[in-house]
């Protein structure tokens, strides 16, 4: 084995060495029929046409034609690994979830790290939030904590999610990333200020996946064995220490090693440097929620740690690389609605929206039986229900068990102990406008009290360096929002933009072809 190469580079050599004692397998078709010749098609004579009967060729080609599945509409580029969660502190007074049952308990986990906006071949070192999703394989079924590396998000109402993502992705005509789209949306929705400020700070480009924190971000509900509930947030803090990339290093790596994050994670695990995160909860009682200065379910806000301190729970440890990327990482499906008894949703609107969106996109991307795929299968629980059939039904389809409920034949019975926590709601049913639910207080605290002078300078430089490519009328809207956070924030960004704009004058008028018209007026006149 070449000494200078890393485990990721030597994967095939390693695979060969592991099988050194074995004879090579017999090559087969998908149906298991042995193949005699895999290098030449069957033709009529050496220069003649192919025969349809060449099933070795058609079997291979037909499968190849269907290799690609739709990439994730967000979080398409990612890295995955496996390991365990170990309980180190007792939180059974808050939650009856089996995953927290006793100190020392270990639960297998799968984790996927990702960027958000880029396609599956995009660079790992872009300025973008990072997905940090954890699947816990518990005895009460899977718990999917579908988190990010920030405790907040750009929006608080899920109806905006498709538009927000469209604004981050490619222009529908040019198929280019479009700063006008990005900053137009952000400037029209100032609830994005908190996440935008975090994103353009030093933490906006983590150094790989091992050196960043994770957050469940949403507010959840924990329920104990007595049926008592509290609200909670989940945090997982890196034991490797926070490390970020400079703008220059990130740009260099995106050219030299766009898969930097995947490679770093794979090599760390392959060399026994198992990354770990300390897992915490924040707890808020229902009474505290009443007096919290903000909506405690607002995804654009954090809960101050001083008032809601981090309570240690356990450790997440990653100690196994995927055996096959497609099978275990591309096909893994995280779904926030997978919550075992003891963990429930709060009224967080974004979480509520995700409870629908995630399983819906998985059914599209992987098929309605995506939970039969081994990496998604709740293998530590016994699945027994009245769901049957459908494309790619992979197990025994629950044999001859009755497929209707109720029944008189001893088929699966409901468990009253798994009933959801009941809560009283009353209020007007309508579309509540949350656009102005205090978009500045926490951003102001972040800018004034959290960042030092150097960090504020870099934040403003990073923002201006991106915002400069948007039209001037959009720049003005954005600067107005930053000024509302703090006059210095806006004026520093404006000063940098003035420099950029002096060097590169802009057309302040946004011209576009009206929808339904494929020809500009001038071209029509020439017809």
């Amino acid at each position: 084995m070449a000494d200078s190469r890393d485990p990721a580079s030597d994967q095939m050599q390693h695979w060969k060495e592991q099988r050194a004692a074995q004879k090579a397998d017999v090559l087969t078709t998908g149906a298991g029929n042995p193949v005699g010749d895999k290098l030449n098609v069957i033709t009529v004579g050496p220069r003649g046409p192919l025969l349809v009967q060449d099933v070795v060729f058609t079997d291979e080609m037909a499968h190849f034609d269907r290799e690609r599945i739709p990439e994730r509409v967000v979080h398409a580029k990612g890295a995955g690994a496996f390991g365990y969660f170990e309980v180190t502190h007792d939180i059974t007074k808050y939650s009856k979830a089996k995953v927290f049952e006793h100190i020392g308990k270990k639960t297998p986990i799968a984790v996927r790290f990702s960027t958000v906006a880029g396609e599956s071949g995009s660079a790992d070192t872009v300025r973008d939030p990072r997905g940090f999703a954890v699947k816990f394989y518990t005895e009460d079924g899977n718990w999917d904590l579908v988190g990010n590396n920030t405790p907040i998000f750009f929006i608080r109402d899920p109806i905006l999610f498709p538009s927000f993502i469209h604004s981050q992705k490619r222009n529908p005509q040019t198929h280019l990333k479009d700063p006008d789209m990005v900053w137009d949306f952000w400037s029209l929705r100032p609830e994005s200020l908190h996440q935008v400020s975090f994103l353009f700070s030093d933490r906006g480009i983590p150094d790989g996946h091992r050196h960043m924190n994770g957050y469940g971000s949403h507010t959840f509900k924990l329920v104990n064995a007595n049926g008592e509930a509290v609200y909670c947030k989940f945090h997982y803090k890196t034991d490797q220490g926070i490390k970020n990339l400079s703008v220059e290093d990130a740009a260099r790596l995106s050219q030299e090693d766009p898969d930097y994050g995947i490679r770093d994670l794979f090599n760390a695990i392959a060399t026994g440097k198992y990354p770990s995160w300390t897992f915490y909860i924040q707890v808020m009682t229902f009474n505290q929620a009443e007096t919290f200065p903000f909506n405690p379910f607002d995804l654009t806000k954090v809960w101050p740690h001083k008032d809601y301190p981090l309570i240690p729970v356990g450790k997440l440890v990653l100690n196994r690389n995927p055996v096959n990327y497609f099978a275990e990482v591309e096909q893994i499906a995280f779904d926030p609605s997978n919550m075992p008894p003891g963990i429930e949703a709060s009224p967080d609107k974004m979480l509520q929206g995700r409870l629908f969106a995630y399983p819906d996109t998985h059914r599209h991307r992987l098929g309605p039986n995506y939970l039969h795929i081994p990496v998604n299968c709740p293998y530590r629980a016994r699945v027994a229900n009245y769901q049957r059939d459908g494309p790619m039904c992979m197990q025994d389809n629950q044999g001859g068990a009755p497929n209707y409920y109720p029944n008189s034949f001893g088929a699966p019975e409901q468990q009253p102990s798994a009933l959801e926590h009941s809560i009283q709601y009353s209020g007007e049913v309508r579309r509540f406008n949350t656009a102005n639910d205090d978009n500045v207080t926490q951003v102001r605290a972040f800018y004034v009290n959290v960042l030092n002078e150097e960090q504020r300078k870099r934040l403003c430089e990073n923002i201006a360096g991106h915002l400069k490519d948007a039209q001037i009328f959009i720049q003005k809207k954005a600067v107005k929002n930053f000024t509302e956070v703090h006059p210095d924030y806006g004026s520093h960004i404006q000063a940098l933009l003035d420099k950029y704009n002096a060097e590169k004058p802009k057309n302040a008028i946004h011209t576009f072809v009206q929808s339904g018209s494929h020809l500009a007026a001038r071209e029509k006149a020439n017809l």
């Epitope: 001083k306 500045v440 102001r444 009290n449 959290v450």
Partner: nanobody, 122 residues
Amino acid sequence: QVQLVESGGGLVQPGGSLRLSCAASASIFSIYVMAWYRQAPGKQRELVATVTSGGATNYANSVKGRFTISRDNAKNTMDLQMNSLKPEDTAVYYCNAEDYYDYGLSRSKIYWGQGTQVTVSS
């Protein structure tokens, strides 16, 4: 260091109104949250209302619909308009300001005023 001074307390009949004011000695522009607390004789201090630097307000259930908190970051003042006052509103009212810092807002500086007496009695 921020000094807070309350004013506007006094004796008022049930059903009447009062307006409390809190003046700060320094800029409150970036102070995360300001609040009014009250303490009735022999009872614990309780939160009445809060207002964030961005203007989000919240009220204790006992005063919702009767009290209105407001804040003027330019004038460094906070007010509490109290309407439909009841005898159980009798207490010393304190102005409070809390400023958070650190990632996760894990530490804070807390400032209190000396308090102003409100008595609701016929």
